[in-house]
Interface confidence: low
């Protein structure tokens, strides 16, 4: 059976959106109105991996790019890419681990842990404008949770 | 060809008004972040004012923090700078500009030829 | 605000001549997350107005000449010109785009 997916957006705990800056990087900025167009719609799929009540496996993909976002070790750290994929081949069921994120539910809030590297997390910053990346503290200044708006396919 | 044209400077009094514009032409105006930098006369650059494609995010340098007003129209490809309580200290060449979204922000990659402002009595 | 020193203020230089632009932050502009410096350096002809040349501290905007080159990490950045031409005079301004932008106070590059 084909891989279950579907649309959406990204808000950060702060309501910052996601947005591309450059070609292989998000950022997150507060947008409003006609500026909400730039936030990046993801297709998040859900694949194979350890499952729970309040833990899905997820890929997340770019909408009508083959971007992903993976996990890599860079300099020894968990670091968060956008990853070229061949469209033929993705999504899967069987996603690379590093491509795969628990998606989890508390309080009507979301976090995305890594498969590949646990307790490290999708994250923003308190700031304006800055990367999202792959942080390893919860509950710090960095912000690891989020909300998910469903778009329409 | 991008083209970006101030105008709208001239002489006005300390604690008078202006209202700078710039004409975009040769890019999808809707698409890009813009920007206001000025020259004081002999002086180096400094950043005035940017504002997001959408008009929907601002920021502003502190020393007009209050004082001035981005705004644009992407129906007529124009930006505006509405300055108030002016200074002494506001004479410059006014530079509109465009930011360079995908690269990083405020990466400035088209300048126009700028609009001269002096306050003085 | 980040704070951008340019060191020197003036620099004669003859044709054909290598030219250096120092330019020290008050702080870094290395973003550990995305391993970029954002750091960019512009030029302004007598009378123009200025014109991109490197961003990310090293990166190249298009259509300008390979003789100029940028370098440098964390609070130090060098432009370098390998070698100066006659329409290369003008002031070369580098600035921060880690936070909202401050230029340096520009560096007037004349011909010998």
């Known amino acids: 059976a084909p891989v279950r997916s579907l649309h959406c957006t990204l808000r950060d705990a702060q309501l910052k959106s996601l947005v591309m800056s450059g070609p292989y990087e998000l950022k997150a900025l507060h947008l409003q109105g006609q500026d909400l167009e730039q936030q990046v719609v993801f297709s998040m799929s859900f694949v194979q991996g350890e499952e729970s009540n309040d833990k899905i496996p997820v890929a997340l993909g770019l909408k009508a790019k083959n971007l992903y976002l993976s996990c890599v070790l860079k300099d020894d750290k968990p670091t968060l890419q956008l990853e070229s994929v061949d469209p033929k081949n993705y999504p899967k069921k069987k996603m690379e681990k590093r491509f795969v994120f628990n998606k989890i539910e508390i309080n009507n809030k979301l976090e995305f842990e890594s498969a590949q590297f646990p307790n490290w997390y999708i994250s923003t910053s308190q700031a304006e404008n800055m990367p999202v990346f792959l942080g390893g503290t919860r509950g710090g200044q960095d912000i690891t949770d989020f909300t998910m708006q469903f778009v329409s396919s | 060809e991008v083209q970006l044209v101030e105008s709208g400077g001239g002489l006005v009094q300390p604690g008078g008004s202006l209202r700078l514009s710039c004409a975009a032409s040769?890019?999808?105006?809707?698409?890009?972040?813009m920007h206001w930098v000025r020259q004081a006369p002999g002086k180096g650059l400094e950043w005035v004012a940017y504002i997001s494609i959408g008009s929907y995010t601002v920021h502003y340098a502190d020393s007009v923090k209050g004082r001035f007003t981005i705004s644009r129209d992407n129906a007529k490809n124009s930006l505006y700078l509405q300055m108030n309580s002016l200074r002494d200290e506001d004479t410059a060449v006014y530079y509109c500009?465009?930011?360079?979204?995908?690269?990083?922000?405020?990466?400035?990659?088209?300048w126009g030829q700028g609009t001269t402002v002096t306050v003085s009595s | 605000d980040i704070v951008m020193t340019q060191t020197p203020l003036s620099l004669p230089v003859t044709p054909g001549e290598p030219a250096s632009i120092s330019c020290k932050s008050s702080q870094s502009l290395l973003n550990s997350r995305t391993r970029k410096n954002y750091l960019a350096w512009y030029l302004q002809k007598p009378g123009q107005s200025p014109q991109l040349l490197i961003y990310w501290a090293s990166t190249r905007e298009s259509g300008v000449p390979d003789r100029f080159s940028g370098s440098g990490s964390g609070t130090d950045f060098t432009l370098k010109i390998s070698r100066v031409e006659a329409e290369d005079v003008g002031v070369y301004y580098c600035?921060?785009?880690?936070?909202?932008?401050?230029f340096g106070q520009g560096t007037k590059l004349e011909i010998k």
């Open positions: 500009v465009r930011d360079d979204y995908d690269v990083t922000d405020y990466t400035m990659d088209y």
């Open positions: 040769g890019f999808t105006f809707s698409s890009f972040g």
């Open positions: 600035k921060q785009t880690y936070n909202f932008p401050t």
